[in-house]
Interface confidence: low
């Protein structure tokens, strides 16, 4: 029997210019009668060139929804009806092509041909896109508030911010032809729920889409879009209701910037330069393709790239990469932000060199990606410590915490956190090595105490990168380094002269210099130590609620004891600053540290004094007594105390706690308490200082209160930011 | 320093109980866990319980829950054992020792051998 | 309850013997294991806790290796007072466990 066909819409969006017209403002207002006059004309124009093509028998509707700069370019979207089995044939290329044809098959022909009775259509300015039903709906939404702008060259415009009496806007936004359009979007409130979405064509098409933003991200206070070319929307839908713009846009057109390089490395080890996408950290445009070539001095060496946040991942089949393709030595890999180091090793095997190829596949990018190059020692890629293959980095063997994600750096370790004897392989202790007493068989504990060592896991790295034996030289009176290095910035870590936390007791006035108290509108939130003229370090959790995240909110107080009272040791700061670790995760908790930059430098008493930094080789013994104060509740769910408290705790091993927490702890964690429960730290004591004394009766800061089951449960210990994990963020921060 | 003092040797018949003291000094119990632990003659060692004598929270290998309580004198900074229900197999000497939290025992008792004899 | 096997259960050594006592643990134990020494009519000592710690006091000839399941105690040059029976136990989890002993004995 007679079977009716199947019919199915296909949506189409696009955009031509007029070359004997041209824009004017008028055109940019919807409700001028310059504009109604004008969409009536152009879509008339519009419907007879589809109609004059084999298309005519499949039109449906069209719309011409915007006008902009080139001397007259008219943005559209139109619909056919297609059978089924006809839909593949009429892609968006087949639909352009037939229409450039169209307009060819005309421009000297004598003849009346509708379409051209007032506009002169240039066949090599149409562009033809595949839209969506759902793509229309968007973008009609928005033609209540839809404003157009072009920007031309040097230029950088602000926009105008969102009409609030809409629930969506959009700007289309046109630069001059060969330039590439750079938005800006900087939000200016700490909390909201507007959205943005920007897309790389001048409508809301969902397959055009670059990036979308959703909500005063605090992770990208800034973001900086780049599109392919010099058209670009930007859609905003209404969060909640505010009378103030939440964010600023501004647009600038730059030139494109070439990706392409040739190097040749030196003979020498480490990071020896950058390679970044196109106007690095702005977002990597649409069509981004980078080619490096590195050329390598001796096939002694590989190639070592060291990503930010990001890593390359082998992709299963040939799905498209959503986050940069990577092509290196004739390998694909895809790009992942991901919130950790990465670092990939190219083995090298030819002196021809290595071409690495980035390209954006798809429309959807993301932040600009920045990687540095470097050489490394193929037959011994990390001296001292551990490769890691699962990704790419050096990590400390036999320390007792697993770094690498599958635990083998702590595989077969004769010696465990500990030191081991060259004579028999016997373990002694750290603390014992280089103490001047020998304990190893034939003394071998005691060797090469005075001079410098090949750098490995408990090694002290001085500033002219060699490296000592002794284990936690600094600050310990007795220069160890030939530079004297361990013996510098040792200003800190001696408490005033003075003489809850759950379990705890009450310190006196000077007891610690470093505790500090975080509080908002007058209420303690968080503790923190100082651990420089200007700089406070705290937890990063304590500013997981958008409410907090402004600096303007806090307060810091150093040389406070009490809560409800002053004394002349006290001193408050407002907040300059605010760095949270570019890797904290919040459900994890993991890189758990912040940083405040005070407004003013602190003034030294005996009240108010920095604490000692640990260098990322020092060792905290698993068993030590260390010390944490706070003004935390003295009980689980219980009010925050008004004295400061303080309470010791013992380190506990690795693993141990890890098993506790199910293997929720991470290396950048550190556990403390007793598995009696009892002392620990609880709610308000956050960010506070663990510190550990060390022989010269300095303090050094191990960890920071993080997180934990409860407070002073049995069985769960307080979990710590673990400082020898973070270090170098600190130090590149502070310093 | 540190010493761990207990009670003398006791004979019992089958069914009775024993009362075993540890009588501490050099360091207050309250800030440790106080353990017991068994050994029969030619045996392992094997642990049956400890307290926290800051606030008497006890805890018992399944092998002598019912039969084993172990209590606290702060005041006397002593920790007490008593072993209901004696069997012949019950004969041993009976240790106290201390622990750190986590740490293992590091200070025992001279301990107290208890025969259990009709 | 977490078992613990020693080996071997006795073994005969000289005066400056190198020797070595294995530990075997029926579950993960992490680094939470001990080591006691034991003379006739004497009440245990700690040697070694969590697999390498040495005691107060402990001599630098005995060390202690190993975490997980598989667990060692070395005493490097045996002197006269170290014949005695060594005990180790799990301090992982309750009830607290020990291995049945090695028995050092003068050969």
């Known amino acids: 029997g007679y079977k009716a066909e199947v019919m199915v819409s296909q949506v189409y969006s696009g955009s031509l210019r007029v070359l004997n017209r041209h824009f004017s403002q008028d055109l940019t207002r919807r409700e001028s009668s310059a504009f109604r006059s004008e969409t009536a004309k152009a879509q008339k124009m519009l419907k007879e060139l589809i109609t004059s093509t084999r298309l005519g028998t499949y039109y449906n509707s069209s719309s011409v929804y915007s006008f902009g700069e080139g001397p007259l370019t008219c943005f559209f979207w139109f619909i056919l009806q297609i059978p089924e089995h006809r839909r593949l044939m009429l892609s968006p290329e087949v639909v352009q092509a037939l229409l450039v044809e169209e307009l060819l098959s005309t421009v000297n022909s004598s003849a009346a041909v509708p379409y051209r009775a007032e506009y002169e259509v240039d066949p090599e300015g149409l562009v033809i896109l595949e839209a969506s039903v759902k793509d229309i709906a968007a973008l009609n939404s928005t033609l209540g508030c839809y404003r157009y702008s072009y920007v031309g060259q040097g230029q950088v415009l602000r926009l105008k911010g969102p009409d609030h009496l809409a629930s969506s806007c959009l700007w289309h936004l046109q630069g001059p032809k060969d330039l590439m359009l750079k938005l800006r979007l900087e939000w200016t409130l700490a909390e909201c729920r507007d959205r943005l979405a920007m897309y790389d064509v001048a409508g809301p098409l969902e397959k055009r889409l670059i990036t979308s933003v959703y909500g005063c991200s605090r992770q990208e206070p800034v973001v900086e879009v780049l599109a392919s070319g010099a058209i670009m929307a930007v859609v905003w839908k209404k969060g909640l209701h505010s009378y103030y713009d939440p964010f600023v846009l501004s647009v600038q057109p730059v030139v494109f910037q070439a990706c392409e390089v040739n190097l040749t490395l030196d003979n020498r080890l480490d990071s020896q330069g950058v390679l970044s996408t196109p106007y690095f950290p702005s977002y990597y445009s649409p069509q981004t393709h980078c080619s490096w070539h590195l050329t390598v001095p001796s096939l002694d060496y590989g190639l070592a790239l060291w990503f930010d946040a990001y890593a390359l991942r082998r992709q299963k089949y040939d799905l498209p990469c959503t986050q940069g393709q990577w092509t290196i030595q004739n390998r694909r890999l895809c790009g992942l932000r991901i919130l950790q180091p990465y670092a990939e090793r190219i083995p090298v095997v030819a002196t021809a060199g290595i071409t690495i190829n980035f390209t954006s596949q798809i429309s959807l990018t993301g932040p600009g990606v920045r990687v540095h190059y470097g050489l490394y020692n193929q037959s011994d890629p990390c001296p001292g410590e551990f490769l890691c293959s699962v990704n790419g980095l050096c990590v400390p063997a036999c320390d007792g915490v697993k770094d690498c994600p599958n635990g083998l750096d702590e595989r077969n370790c004769v010696c465990r956190a500990t030191f081991q004897c060259k004579e028999d392989s016997t373990c002694i202790s750290l603390p014992k090595v280089c103490d001047g007493q020998p304990d190893c068989l034939n003394g071998s504990d005691e060797e090469q105490c005075q001079e410098g060592v090949p750098c490995g896991t408990f090694t002290f790295q001085c500033e002219d990168r060699s490296c000592v034996k002794k284990p936690n030289p600094q600050c310990d009176g007795r220069p160890d380094c030939r530079d004297g290095s361990d013996e510098e910035h040792c200003d800190c870590g001696l408490q005033g002269p003075s003489s809850r936390i759950v379990g705890g007791a009450v310190s006196s006035e000077g007891e610690w210099p470093w505790q500090a108290s975080l509080q908002v509108r007058g209420r303690h939130i968080c503790g923190g130590a100082l651990i420089a003229d200007r700089w406070v370090i705290t937890a990063a959790h304590c500013f997981q609620e958008d409410s907090m995240a402004s600096t303007v909110l806090w307060t810091v107080f150093l040389g406070k004891v009490w809560q409800n009272s002053r004394w002349p040791g006290e001193v408050s700061f407002k907040v300059s600053r605010l760095l949270l670790h570019p890797y904290h995760e919040e459900d994890s908790h993991d890189y758990d540290v912040a940083l405040l930059q005070l407004d003013h430098p602190v003034v030294r008493s005996a009240a108010v004094r920095p604490v000692c930094l640990p260098a990322r080789s020092h060792f905290f013994e698993p068993g030590l007594h260390c010390w944490i104060t706070g003004w935390g509740a003295l009980r689980e769910g219980g009010p925050i105390s008004n004295a400061l408290q303080k309470v010791d705790v013992q380190l506990i091993p690795q693993d141990l706690c890890s098993e506790v927490y199910r293997y929720q702890v991470t290396p950048r964690m550190l556990c403390a308490g007793y598995r009696k429960g009892k002392k620990d730290a609880c709610q308000g004591d956050s960010g506070g200082p663990l510190v550990c004394k060390a022989l010269s009766g300095r303090w050094f800061l191990a960890g920071l209160v993080s997180w934990g089951l409860g407070c002073g449960r049995p069985n769960y210990f307080g979990v710590y930011t673990r400082i020898t994990g973070v270090i170098s963020w600190i130090q590149q921060v502070v310093t | 320093q540190v010493q761990l003092v207990q009670s003398g040797a006791e004979v019992k018949k089958p069914g009775a109980s024993v009362k075993v003291s540890c009588k501490a000094s050099?360091?207050?119990?309250?800030?440790?866990?106080m353990h017991w632990v068994r050994q029969a003659p030619g045996q392992r060692l094997e642990w049956m319980g400890r307290?926290?004598?800051?606030?008497?929270?006890?805890t018992y290998s399944p092998k002598f829950q019912g039969r084993v309580t172990i209590i606290p004198d702060t005041s006397a900074n002593t920790a007490y054992m008593e072993l209901s229900s004696l069997r012949s197999e019950d004969t041993a000497v009976y240790y106290c020792?201390?622990?750190?939290?986590?740490?293992?025992?590091?200070?025992w008792g001279q301990g107290t051998l208890v025969t259990v004899s009709s | 309850d977490i078992q613990m096997t020693q080996s071997p259960k006795s073994l005969s050594a000289s005066v400056g013997d190198r020797v070595t006592i294995t530990c075997r643990a029926s579950?993960?134990?992490?680094?939470?294991l001990a080591w006691y020494q034991q003379k006739p009519g004497q009440s245990p000592k700690l040697l070694i806790y969590?697999?390498?710690t040495r005691h107060s006091g402990v001599p630098s000839r005995f060390s202690g290796s190993g975490s997980g399941t598989d667990f060692t105690l070395t005493i490097s040059s045996l002197q006269p007072e170290d014949f005695a029976t060594y005990y180790c136990?799990?301090?992982?989890?309750?009830?607290?466990?020990f291995g049945q002993g090695t028995k050092l004995e003068i050969k």
């Open positions: 020792a201390r622990s750190i939290y986590l740490d293992p025992m590091d200070y």
């Open positions: 050099g360091f207050n119990i309250e800030d440790y866990y």
């Open positions: 307290i926290d004598p800051e606030d008497g929270e006890t």
């Open positions: 579950q993960d134990v992490t680094t939470a």
């Open positions: 969590w697999a390498t």
């Open positions: 136990q799990q301090h992982y989890s309750t009830p607290y466990t």
